[in-house]
């Protein structure tokens, strides 16, 4: 039975130019996480591997960091970035969990960003 | 190379505690889940639990709970069994069996060579 | 709990003929997320277990291709094309779809 839930950030917005953290936090089960990767779209952003640890994917190098966490924090931001973002959790012995982010980049100087989460 | 080196075999009397230790070696021990098996002599093999190795949070078997910890030292890489108020029905090889890396979806991918556990008075 | 029954529980095979193994649940084991957590063990004597098929028909790392698995719903088959020496043992099904994930009680292969 797969008991765990994903909080994520929720809908976010962030200024063209800027940077956002994207966040997703497993809860609600002893599952491990064996392997997260962050996907746009059909898009793989970056993966962070238990073993080998954290690959970006080559034409995000220049604009994505690792963390903090198993987080993600995207730099440089474009219009273009706006749209959805996931966060999926492979774990033992639950399988796949995936959360969603959606993130807006404004043109305009006055972003307002969501609540900053926080991995406790 | 994944290594599970199990310590060896107890005696012990009716009553009587043993605990049994895994010690994991050739990759880093938090990443993964591991888990227990028992096989009585000539019988067939009973899943115990795990214990999540990140966190420390137990899962037992409903046969196993009670009597049956799990535990860790994670400065030494090595995950334990405890058994209390030992019965004559708990003689058996206990091993522990780590969970796989990522792209294998198995419960058990390596094994520890089993721990013998003998209760007798 | 889910009871896995395997047949036959002795099987006597020739070198370098085939082996068959059933193995039903006695109730499917779809996991809630899709999959299925069917495997087949070897234990050679005096040794530990080891996985040789999982999630069905999905060979584990460095298993002999005469090594096959088959089945859906509650009806499994381990099968070895061309049975070796080596193979010698007891082989267990499991499912690690519902908890507390079980056993079947093995069959024994032997050589005749």
């Known amino acids: 039975m797969m008991t765990g839930t994903i909080e994520t950030t929720g809908n976010i917005s962030a200024e063209k130019g800027g940077s956002i953290i994207l966040q997703c936090h497993l809860s609600s089960t002893t599952a491990q996480v064996t392997q997260v990767n962050w996907e746009q779209q059909d898009q793989l952003l970056a993966i962070c591997n238990a073993d080998l640890g954290w690959h970006i994917s080559p034409s995000f190098k220049d604009r994505v960091a690792p963390g903090p966490g198993l987080g993600l924090t995207l730099q440089s931001l474009t219009v273009n970035d706006t749209g959805e973002y996931f966060c999926i959790y492979h774990t033992y012995p639950d399988g796949t969990y995936t959360g969603r982010i959606f993130l807006e980049v404004l043109e305009s100087s006055v972003a307002e960003h969501g609540a900053r989460f926080q991995i406790p | 190379q994944v290594q599970l080196v199990q310590s060896g075999s107890e005696l012990k009397k009716p009553g009587a505690s043993v605990k049994v230790s895994c010690k994991a070696s050739?990759?880093?021990?938090?990443?993964?889940?591991m888990n227990w098996v028992r096989q009585a002599p000539g019988q067939g093999l009973e899943w115990m639990g795990w214990?999540?190795?990140?966190?420390?949070?137990?899962t037992y078997a409903d046969d196993f709970k009670g009597r049956f910890v799990f535990s860790l030292d994670t400065s030494v890489s090595t995950a334990y069994l405890q058994i209390s108020s030992l019965k004559a029905e708990d003689t058996a090889v206990y091993y522990c069996a780590r969970a796989p890396p990522y792209g294998y979806d198995v419960r058990f991918a390596y094994w520890g060579q089993g721990t013998l556990v003998t209760v007798s008075s | 709990d889910v009871v896995m029954t395997q047949s036959p529980l002795s099987l006597p095979v020739t070198l370098g003929q085939p082996a068959s193994i059933s193995c039903r649940s006695s109730?499917?084991?779809?996991?809630?997320?899709?999959?299925?957590?069917l495997e087949w063990f070897q234990q050679r004597p005096g040794q530990s277990p080891r996985v040789l098929i999982y999630?069905?028909?999905d060979r584990f790392s460095g298993v002999p291709d005469r090594f096959s698995g088959s089945g859906s719903g509650t009806d499994f088959t381990l099968k070895i094309s061309r049975v070796e020496a080596e193979d010698v043992g007891v082989y267990y099904c499991f499912q690690g779809s519902h908890v507390p994930w079980t056993f079947g009680r093995g069959t024994k292969l032997e050589i005749k």
């Open positions: 109730q499917s084991i779809v996991h809630s997320n899709g999959n299925t957590y």
């Open positions: 214990i999540n190795t990140y966190t420390g949070e137990p």
């Open positions: 999630k069905v028909s």
């Open positions: 050739g990759y880093t021990f938090t990443n993964y889940g």
